[in-house]
């Protein structure tokens, strides 16, 4: 990260509760590690609108985590 040094986690604060499904290009899940002791759900928005962290406790995040885990395992 050229400007901000990485802290323990990638997200700042609790994250958004929900993102419009139509705006989601990609969802990435970062599981707890030595760098960050909590799960983080990072949404890449369509149309070059950047990224947002989804609150991992939100209903939408739980659904995304479940979906990704089902796909991977």
């Amino acid at each position: 990260f050229p400007m901000f040094k990485r802290g323990r986690c990638l997200c700042i604060g609790p994250g958004v509760k929900a993102v419009k499904v139509a705006d989601i290009e990609k969802a990435s899940i970062m599981y707890p590690s030595n760098n960050c002791d909590k799960i983080e759900v990072i949404i890449t928005l369509k149309e070059n609108k950047g990224q947002r962290c989804l609150n991992p406790k939100s209903k939408q995040a739980r659904l995304i985590i479940k979906k990704v885990e089902r796909k991977n395992f």
């Epitope: 990260f1 050229p2 990485r6 700042i12 990224q51």
Partner: nanobody, 129 residues
Framework: EVQLVESGGGLVQAGGSLRLSCATS????????IGWFRQAPGKEREGVSI????????YYADSVKGRFTISSDNAKNTVYLQMNSLKPEDTAVYYC??????????????????????WGQGTQVTVSS
């Protein structure tokens, strides 16, 4: 209605100090990260410093580390940016913003999003040499 009101900008000589304040209202302080951003003429808006109200984490741009300090008074819902050892290159309009879901790595090329971010009107900081 959400409001963020900045104050404390002005003209200062290089090496001097300023303290910016951002008074917020209309939202739950702990649900948001509060950040200071700046925009110099002809340049993109860039992240300067961010405070996560929920856990007290702070983040600083390399260019201001060791010179700027972000803090808050939660009782007053106000965030401060203490700026010391100011340089001419710190000259810019400084904006306070409240946002949800900010990703640290994207703060250099920050894209505001109406649904998740609230912005103040900005305060001019001019550092003369």
């Amino acid at each position: 209605e959400v409001q963020l009101v900045e104050s404390g900008g002005g003209l200062v000589q290089a090496g001097g100090s300023l303290r910016l304040s951002c008074a917020t209202s209309g939202f739950t302080f702990d649900d948001y990260a509060i950040g200071w951003f700046r925009q110099a003429p002809g340049k993109e808006r860039e992240g300067v410093s961010i405070l996560s109200s929920s856990d007290g984490s702070t983040y600083y741009a390399d260019s201001v580390k060791g010179r700027f300090t972000i803090s808050s008074d939660n009782a007053k819902n106000t965030v401060y940016l203490q700026m010391n050892s100011l340089k001419p290159e710190d000259t810019a309009v400084y904006y306070c913003a409240a946002g949800q879901g900010w990703v640290i790595a994207t703060m250099t090329s920050f894209r505001a999003h109406r649904e998740y971010d609230y912005w103040g009107q900005g305060t001019q900081v001019t550092v003369s040499s």
